[in-house]
């Protein structure tokens, strides 16, 4: 499993972009098979982020090789039955680290999309996907969580109580000869998510659930989230009927609880509080929050919503505030540009997250042999001769100000400058006029002063003038 430049796809380059160490992480998104592959539609089947990822260090000038990826699994839980056909979207994100990163700290490097057919319970499928100059090698599989079985995880099976036969009226679970298919009729009200039955009109609970209808969660430790401790025998109780009970979301929408209420994630073509509104063309205005609708001129063609920064979802209905994580240090402004986050730093700070204090000599060195001087809560660079600017990165021309008077020629020199004076003039800057009768120079100069020979002077110091 690796991510890197593909063969014959242009000049090899490192994901780290020659800007120091970086970290890659992956976002995996599952969409229904009918979903448009190239669009930013809702990950209706599920989505997940990779967790532990190693830091890659790239040195400028090195040829970029594919980066080995850790074997850590990315688990994407899916709701309901496994559809068999689906769209698999894998986004590769780069997080730039280190002090010379520059630019946005996070960038979407590559996005591969492919429509796939896969039965649950099968072996790992290997895949290679290319996009632009990048190539991603990965494997994937679908598996059911017990007690679900089958290619679609739609049947509930339990181990047989006896090796030879299933319970009354129950058939063997093909192709699982050691398991029995659960009956279709359980006790009325038995939780379809947390209960099952091996005989009609019973309600057996899956691990972690209890109660006559398997609606009460069991906990051996402290109660999680909004659950409250119940009687000792029942463990933890939900405060009451959940807002998602019975799934209020229509048209295939999936429900999630949000602070006592619910929120529907609607499939493409539906929106509204309960996904009850159908609007499959751009004329219906399906894109919210300033999203730009593209395509979908008629009901048979799909539309795509291009969402502004801070919004996502097939209809730009989901507010996401990536800046709420406060990635910018030292009071920098976080700007969500959609494709990336950027930190704009306050004066005196720099770096992709404004992590470097420029007023601190430890923060950044002065270039070209300059020395850093701190004082009064700020820092400045004392530059070597021939260099200037805030960080001594600008080449200074000592002759630019025409320092040699009376037509003298200026020569840049390692220790400053040298003036070659015109006949009749002398001095460091040719400021003295020499009297033709051999009298004192004007203005007066010390007796015995001779005009320097710049050629011999330069040669003596083993430096050639520029």
């Amino acid at each position: 499993h690796s991510f890197g430049p593909g063969p014959g796809l242009g000049t090899p380059r490192s994901p780290c972009n020659a800007r120091g160490p970086c970290r890659l992480f992956f976002r995996v998104c599952l969409k229904p098979g009918v979903s448009q592959e190239a669009t930013e539609s809702l990950c209706a089947l599920g989505a997940a982020l990779s967790t532990s990822v190693p830091v890659y260090t790239e040195h400028p000038g090195e040829s970029a090789a594919a980066l080995p990826l850790p074997d850590g699994l990315v688990r994407v839980p899916f709701r309901d039955a496994w559809p068999g056909t689906f769209s698999l979207v894998i986004e590769t994100w780069r997080e730039q680290l280190g002090e010379h990163a520059g630019g946005p700290a996070w960038n979407l490097l590559a996005r591969v999309v492919g429509r796939r057919r896969l039965a649950a319970g099968g072996p790992w499928a290997r895949d290679v996907q290319r996009t632009g100059t990048w190539e991603l090698h990965f494997s994937y599989r679908a598996r059911c969580e017990p007690p679900a079985v089958g290619a679609a995880c739609a049947r509930l099976c339990r181990s047989r109580s006896a090796p030879s036969r299933c319970g009354p009226g129950l058939r063997p679970c093909t192709p699982f000869p050691d398991e029995c298919e659960a009956p279709s009729v359980c006790r009325p009200g038995c939780s379809p998510e947390h209960g099952y039955c091996e005989e009609p009109d019973e309600c057996r609970c899956l691990e972690g659930w209890t109660g006559p209808l398997c609606t009460v969660p069991v906990s051996t430790s402290s109660c999680l989230n909004s659950r409250v401790p119940g009687p000792a025998s029942t463990g933890c109780l939900l405060p009451g009927p959940g807002p998602c009970d019975g799934n209020p979301c229509a048209n295939g929408g999936s429900c999630s609880e949000t602070s006592g209420s619910f929120e529907c994630a609607c499939p493409r073509g539906f929106y509204g509080l309960r996904c009850e509104v159908s609007g499959v063309t751009c004329a219906d205005g399906p894109c919210f929050n300033g999203g730009l609708c593209v395509g979908g001129e008629d009901p048979d063609s799909a539309y795509v919503c291009h969402c502004p920064p801070g919004f996502q979802g097939s209809n730009c209905e989901k507010r996401v505030d990536r800046c709420s994580l406060q990635p910018c240090q030292n009071g920098g402004l976080c700007l969500d540009l959609g494709h990336a986050l950027r930190c704009r730093c306050r004066a005196g700070f720099a770096g992709p997250r404004c992590e470097h204090d420029l007023d601190d000599c430890a923060g950044r060195a002065c270039a070209n042999g300059g020395t850093c001087v701190e004082g009064g809560g700020s820092r400045r660079c004392s530059c070597a001769l021939g260099f200037g600017g805030r960080d001594c990165r600008e080449r200074a021309d000592p002759c630019a100000s025409r320092p040699c008077a009376h037509g003298g020629r200026c020569y840049a020199h390692f220790s400053g400058l040298v003036c070659a004076c015109a006949p009749g003039y002398m001095g460091v800057r040719c400021e003295f006029a020499v009297r033709p009768d051999g009298a004192d120079a004007v203005p007066a100069a010390p007796r015995g002063l001779r005009q320097a020979d710049p050629q011999r002077f330069l040669h003596h110091h083993h430096h050639h003038h520029h």
Epitope: G290, P308, S324, L335, L337, R342, A347
Partner: antibody, heavy 122, light 107 residues
């Protein structure tokens, strides 16, 4: 289409106060950082202040720090600039503007308002 | 603070001329630079963003180049409606700073 409309300018005496407003429409106001920029008569442009989309982060030019306060009400799609201790040198046309960082994201309309004139004189 | 030095401050040119305006940043600003055009009594109009990207609706005779500290706005063939004042703006870091402006007048 993006539109920005400033109001609240006028004549005020030195030491006085004024509150400028900027009504925004045509884009998701709360997603974008906003700026105030001013231009003294016959002079160049000067950045005054910036506020983040959420309103949680604010930034000021040294010339107005401690006297001006930028704020926003995202429920009303409105940006504000409260100006106190006004001086003669604050006389200028004040523009509200969407932050230049978003110039490649938004299309159509004006990223700058038409401006409102603030005159500080006795 | 980053100083933006714009040159020339004023220039005379004729219709059809190629005009070049320069902005120099006192320290590197990557490509976080925008160019504006302003006519008397009007609002500044954005021409170029990200140093070299042409804003939609702006004629292709306008172009921007440069990165780091040296930036250039070029008008390939000056038109009558291009006589105006041009400003650069750096938005790499706070405080945001504008160039002093270049007034392009009719020769």
């Amino acid at each position: 289409e993006v539109q920005l409309l400033e109001s609240g300018g006028g004549l005020v005496q030195p030491g006085g106060s004024l509150r400028l407003s900027c009504a925004a429409s045509g884009f998701t106001f709360s997603s974008y950082a906003m700026n105030w920029v001013r231009q003294a008569p016959g002079k160049g442009l000067e950045w005054v202040s910036t506020i983040s989309g959420s309103g949680g982060s604010t930034y000021y030019a040294d010339s107005v720090k401690g006297r001006f306060t930028i704020s926003r009400d995202n429920s009303k799609n409105t940006l504000y600039l409260q100006m106190n201790s006004l001086r003669a040198e604050d006389t200028a046309v004040f523009y509200c503007a969407i932050d230049p960082e978003y110039y490649d994201i938004l299309t159509g309309g004006d990223y700058w308002g038409q401006g409102t004139l603030v005159t500080v004189s006795s | 603070d980053i100083q933006m030095t714009q040159s020339p401050s004023a220039m005379s040119a004729s219709v059809g001329d190629r005009v070049t305006i320069t902005c120099r940043a006192s320290q590197g600003i990557s490509n976080y630079l925008a160019w504006f055009q302003q006519k008397p009594g009007k609002v500044p109009k954005r021409l170029i963003y990200a140093a070299s990207s042409l804003q939609s609706g702006v004629p292709s005779r306008f172009s921007g180049s440069g990165s780091g500290t040296e930036f250039t706005l070029t008008i390939s063939s000056l038109q009558p409606e291009d006589f105006a004042t041009y400003f650069c703006l750096q938005h790499d870091s706070f405080p945001l700073t504008f160039g002093g402006g270049t007034k392009v007048e009719i020769k």
